[in-house]
């Protein structure tokens, strides 16, 4: 008996061939001996089976002695043994229909779990193997679960169902709802305008939800909400914003926030959360602000940074085109009695300059100038 695997919702074509290459009397029936379809000469006739409106054949092939049974929009319950009778011969085909579906939704938040459920006909014992877009393989029986979805899990999952040494392949598109970056850091000199961007890693037709930016300033004892906003069909509208600092927000995606000026009291970490309509859980992106200030007070040239810096960052003070006068893994450095000239304060990571502030030290009879 020939075995054919089908996919729920798809179309399958079961073949039946006569020894004579001409149109002759044929009919298909199921295991309950109920007629599905047959012919009356060159015309088709349909039996009273449940398949009635989904069963078909190809009349154009009858003259070649081929009498296929086509079943459209396959259902799991179409799994059965189908018998083609042509001339005095019988051909039996066992059709097994499988379905693979993702739990509830194919749009899942980062960190959530994905469960794939296999629908299979009674008596079958299939095995399933799925390959994620990042090449990770998972195996299972009736259900497969992947916990803690990551951004790289977005894309087409390819699942292979194996039964009777035959296989059928399913492709399921999974969208992991997340920001493009889990965390970002912005380095600014005191007084500069700060731009925060929160690009999403997915695109959907309609995006509706609400969000908030909570900020923990390094100098503050507790965090506070800087801004709350609504998102309706990709349009952003501000609901509430603090007076200090007075953030501005772009009206379109990607989410964009502007801080008029970087000040030491604003340096710190923020957490932008976005709750999407009809989704449990929230999207998160961390954002950090590091602010630099270079000052000269009397005979002391000081460079300071505020905000979340890693211990391996180097803060240096150097006279232009000269070796660094001072270089430390600290958040403040200074030079006493600096010589006149253009001094540079540099925040660097493994030789790469992240932030730079210049200050001009004048001869001792004049006051310093900050460009």
């Amino acid at each position: 008996k020939k075995v054919v695997l089908g996919k729920k919702g798809d179309t399958v074509e079961l073949t039946c061939t006569a020894s004579q290459k001409k149109s002759i009397q044929f009919h298909w029936k199921n295991s309950n001996q109920i007629k599905i379809l047959g012919n009356q000469g060159s015309f088709l006739t349909k039996g009273p089976s449940k398949l009635n409106d989904r069963a078909d054949s190809r009349r154009s092939l009858w003259d070649q002695g081929n009498f296929p049974l086509i079943i459209k929009n396959l259902k799991i319950e179409d799994s059965d043994t189908y018998i083609c009778e042509v001339e005095d011969q019988k051909e039996e085909v066992q059709l097994l229909v499988f379905g693979l579906t993702a739990n509830s939704d194919t749009h899942l938040l980062q960190g959530q779990s994905l469960t794939l459920t296999l629908e299979s006909p009674p008596g079958s014992s299939p095995s399933v193997q799925c390959r994620s877009p990042r090449g990770k393989n998972i195996q299972g029986g009736k259900t497969l679960s992947v916990s803690q979805l990551e951004l790289q899990d977005s894309g087409t999952w390819t699942c292979t169902v194996l039964q009777n040494q035959k296989k059928v392949e399913f492709k399921i598109d999974i969208v992991v709802l997340a920001f493009q970056k889990a965390s970002s850091i912005v380095y600014k000199k005191e007084g500069e305008q700060v731009e925060f961007s929160f690009p999403l890693a997915f695109t959907v037709e309609k995006l509706t939800g609400s969000g908030e930016l909570w900020w923990q300033a390094e100098r503050a004892s507790s965090s506070k909400s800087w801004i709350t906003f609504d998102l309706k069909n990709k349009e952003v509208s501000v609901k509430r914003v603090t007076q200090d600092p007075k953030l501005q927000m772009g009206k379109k995606l990607p989410l964009h926030l502007t801080l008029p000026q970087a000040l030491p009291q604003y340096a710190g970490s923020g957490n932008l959360t976005l709750a999407l309509e009809a989704k449990t859980g929230k999207l998160h992106q961390e954002v950090n602000l590091v602010v630099m200030r270079a000052t000269q007070l009397q005979k002391n040239l000081t460079c300071e940074v505020w905000g979340p810096t890693s211990p391996k960052l180097m803060l240096s003070l150097k006279l232009e085109n000269k070796e660094a006068k001072v270089s430390k893994r600290e958040k403040a450095v200074w030079v006493l009695n600096p010589e006149a000239g253009m001094w540079q304060c540099l925040l660097s990571d493994s030789g790469q300059v992240l932030l730079e502030s210049n200050i001009k030290v004048l001869p001792t009879w004049s006051t310093p100038v900050q460009p």
Partner: antibody
């Protein structure tokens, strides 16, 4: 030429069975479906079932399922229809008919009158 | 089952006149460009005789005054010029889906 010759009239008592024959000639017996159609006095036509002479597979109208049996004898090119548990409303002319291109009933037998009476 | 409803139940037409019989199916009997509707003529004491198959095809040996038309659910048998030998009962039938079903019949008489 194609000919379907049926057996003669029958009188049966309620609860009995009747077996009507239909002998085919003038064509390849196994190549065409044969149906049974009945007509009660002064009434319309009603399809009872069909047989594929090649394989012997039969299909029946749900209305008659369990009471009607179609069989065939390829050696004599004859098809039989047996109706059991007869009741008075089964009194009718029973026809065998052969399919053709586009229709189930191109050639007809002359009919067999079955009378069910106590 | 597909129900075939014929109208009228009986029809009296003068010799040489046109006779028209209608048949309505409870659902479409169209498939793959063809309409699976057939017409039969039955005279007293005789088996039915196929006149038209697949809505409009004239069975061989049938006079061309008989014609069939229609598609989907509505079908018509027309006798363009009624002859004395056309007095009979006419049945429509669908052959797309089992069980094949017949209309109740239309008796055609001469006026």
């Amino acid at each position: 030429q194609v000919q379907l010759v049926q057996s003669g009239a029958e009188v049966k008592k309620p609860g009995a069975s009747v077996k009507v024959s239909c002998k085919a000639s003038g064509y390849t017996f196994t190549a065409y479906v044969i149906s049974w159609v009945r007509q009660a006095p002064g009434q319309g036509l009603e399809w009872m079932g069909e047989i594929y002479p090649g394989s012997g597979s039969s299909y029946y109208n749900e209305k008659f399922k369990g009471r009607v049996t179609n069989t065939r004898d390829t050696s004599t090119s004859t098809v039989y229809m047996e109706l059991s548990s007869l009741r008075s409303e089964d009194t009718a002319v029973y026809y065998c008919a052969r399919s053709g291109d586009g229709s189930r009933f191109v050639y007809w037998g002359q009919g067999t009158l079955v009378t069910v009476s106590s | 089952d597909i129900v075939m409803t014929q109208s009228p139940d009986s029809l009296a037409v003068s010799l040489g006149e046109r006779a028209t019989i209608n048949c309505k199916a409870s659902q479409s009997v169209d498939y793959d460009g063809d309409s699976y509707s057939n017409w039969y003529q039955q005279k007293p004491g005789q088996p039915p005789k196929l006149l038209i198959y697949v809505a409009s095809n004239l069975e061989s040996g049938v006079p061309d005054r008989f014609s069939g038309s229609g598609s989907g659910t509505d079908f018509t048998l027309t006798i363009s010029s009624l002859q004395a030998e056309d007095v009979a009962v006419y049945y429509c039938q669908q052959s797309l889906q089992d069980p094949p079903t017949f209309g109740g019949g239309t008796k055609v008489e001469i006026k």
